[in-house]
């Protein structure tokens, strides 16, 4: 209880925080915080490489989907946005920016197009797209 | 700086929080926090009154749209969900659960249907619907 009371004063809260309530983060200012991950949707269209650079400049990476449960807010995302998934032509696998391989049952990959990058679409779908095509993008920062 | 360092220890963070980063909330556990408001999307379909009751039972209200800027995450919401907007037949106005009147230029009201309740749809649209029709819903809690 003490820490909750302390946080109240720290954040200029006048009411005591119920124990079922908690703070989320820390995240960059004005980012979305959900289950202690930080997300931001960027409206300006960039190609995959520029999108990646933009996220990196904000100490983040392009969206990584690692858990349908922890990231269920992504079910309701409208439109299509670059995520950090790329195709490795040498072995045919899909991997994230951090080098980890896409696990089965996380995303449905939809190949309409020639390409080695993927756009995130609602309901955990990944649409293959040419990496040089401009699109909006999602940055993500995992809290420590 | 001190409060950031303190919060690090409080939240078992090993790194110092950059001053550009901040905590969001407090919110009920596993709710989305954005610009110090808390949101949750409920998947089960309920009529407007049941949706309202569900939000109230969680110390929240149905979604209230009060600022396109502070709530720009709503632009990207897929599908249709009950929000806390109701039609007052006596004076023809639309008002929120708290009794405040819907401000101009916040929502585009689309009358597809006879009804006195409204569904939130992406890009700040409100679809008029019969209040007894089951739909998913969005609860919101404004932090103090």
């Amino acid at each position: 209880i003490w820490s909750a009371v302390f946080l109240n004063s720290l954040f200029n809260q006048e009411v005591q925080i119920p124990l079922t309530e908690s703070y989320c983060g820390p995240c960059p200012k004005n980012w979305i915080c959900y289950k202690n991950n930080c997300y931001q949707f960027f409206n300006e269209s960039k190609n995959w490489y520029e999108s990646q650079a933009s996220c990196m400049s904000q100490n983040a990476s392009l969206l990584k989907v690692y858990s349908k449960e922890d990231q269920d807010l992504l079910k309701l995302v409208k439109s299509y946005h670059w995520m950090g998934l790329v195709h490795i032509p040498t072995n045919g696998s899909w991997q994230w920016e951090d080098g980890s391989i896409l696990s089965p049952n996380l995303l449905t990959i939809i190949e309409m197009q020639k390409g080695d990058c993927a756009l995130y679409a609602s309901s955990f779908k990944g649409y293959i797209e040419n990496c040089s095509i401009p699109n909006t993008y999602i940055c993500m920062q995992r809290t420590v | 700086i001190w409060s950031a360092v303190f919060l690090n220890s409080l939240f078992n963070q090993e790194v110092q929080i950059p001053l550009t980063e901040s905590y969001c909330g407090p919110c009920p556990k596993n709710w989305i926090c954005y610009k110090n408001n808390c949101y949750q999307f409920f998947n089960e379909s309920k009529n407007w009154y049941e949706s309202q009751a569900s939000c109230m039972s969680q110390n929240a209200s149905l979604l209230k749209v009060y600022s396109k800027e502070d709530q720009d995450l709503l632009k990207l919401v897929k599908s249709y969900h009950w929000m806390g907007l109701v039609h007052i037949p006596t004076n023809g106005s639309w008002q929120w659960e708290d009794g405040s009147i819907l401000s101009p230029n916040l929502l585009t009201i689309i009358e597809m249907q006879k009804g006195d309740c409204a569904l939130y749809a992406s890009s700040f649209k409100g679809y008029i619907e019969n209040c007894s029709i089951p739909n998913t819903y969005i609860c919101m809690q404004r932090t103090v």
Epitope: W94, T108, I109, E111 | -
Partner: antibody, heavy 131, light 106 residues
Framework: EVQLVQSGAEVKKPGATVKISCKVS????????MHWVQQAPGKGLEWMGL????????IYAEKFQGRVTITADTSTDTAYMELSSLRSEDTAVYYC????????????????????????WGQGTTVTVSS | SYELTQPLSVSVALGQTARITCGGN??????VHWYQQKPGQAPVLVIY???NRPSGIPERFSGSNSGNTATLTISRAQAGDEADYYC?????????FGGGTKLTVL
């Protein structure tokens, strides 16, 4: 044999709504997306939108956005296309067509969908909009 | 939005080779699909993903795609090949059809 059988011709007044059905047989309904294509008299093909019967997800062409609703009923293996606020320019033949096939065991064990063109089409439904 | 340009009509002598083009900005980076449509009938897929033939489509039908032009080639043209032909691509989360080309076999 794979078949897509569409509902019969319709005559509608301007402002009305039409709903066309497309009943499939000969394959697993949820293994392919379903598309709808419009063809006005003497004109070319125009894609209207698609539905993934597995989860009901839709994508609509900008031209028809807001007026078209595409749905899929997995209990009857039937896809539907509803077009509202009809005008004379909507007088056309409407086709359903399957395309985008499901491969549960794609590379790396991933669930894949591939688009190999619209390989099976319905016979078409003529909609006439006239006052 | 993405535009596909096809010639309105192409004529070919019986037994000769017909080429129908489909122009689009950097179309070579996209998968192109071709459909044949005879009067009063539903379209039929004849080529998918640039150069692949569905089962039941004669070997006389072939496709290529590079740069800004995709091409449908019909060798040893027959009277039964007379039809409208449409190219199609996926762009910006929509399928786009070309305007169609009427093939006449003389």
């Amino acid at each position: 044999e794979v078949q897509l059988v569409q509902s019969g011709a319709e005559v509608k007044k301007p402002g009305a709504t039409v709903k066309i059905s497309c009943k499939v047989s000969g394959y697993t309904f949820t293994d392919y997306y379903m598309h709808w294509v419009q063809q006005a008299p003497g004109k070319g093909l125009e894609w209207m939108g698609l539905v993934d019967p597995e989860d009901g997800e839709t994508i609509y062409a900008e031209k028809f956005q807001g007026r078209v609703t595409i749905t899929a009923d997995t209990s009857t293996d039937t896809a539907y296309m509803e077009l509202s606020s009809l005008r004379s320019e909507d007088t056309a033949v409407y086709y359903c067509a399957r395309g985008i096939a499901r491969y549960p065991n794609g590379p790396g064990g991933l669930l894949y969908y591939y688009y190999y063109g619209m390989d099976v089409w319905g016979q078409g439904t003529t909609v006439t909009v006239s006052s | 939005s993405y535009e596909l340009t096809q010639p309105l009509s192409v004529s070919v002598a019986l037994g000769q080779t017909a080429r129908i083009t489909c122009g689009g900005n950097n179309i070579g980076s996209k998968n192109v699909h071709w459909y044949q449509q005879k009067p009063g009938q539903a379209p039929v897929l004849v080529i998918y993903r640039d150069s692949n033939r569905p089962s039941g489509i004669p070997e006389r039908f072939s496709g290529s795609n590079s740069g800004n032009t995709a091409t449908l080639t019909i060798s040893r043209a027959q009277a039964g090949d007379e039809a409208d032909y449409y190219c199609q691509v996926w762009d910006s989360f929509a399928f786009v059809f070309g305007g169609g080309t009427k093939l006449t076999v003389l």
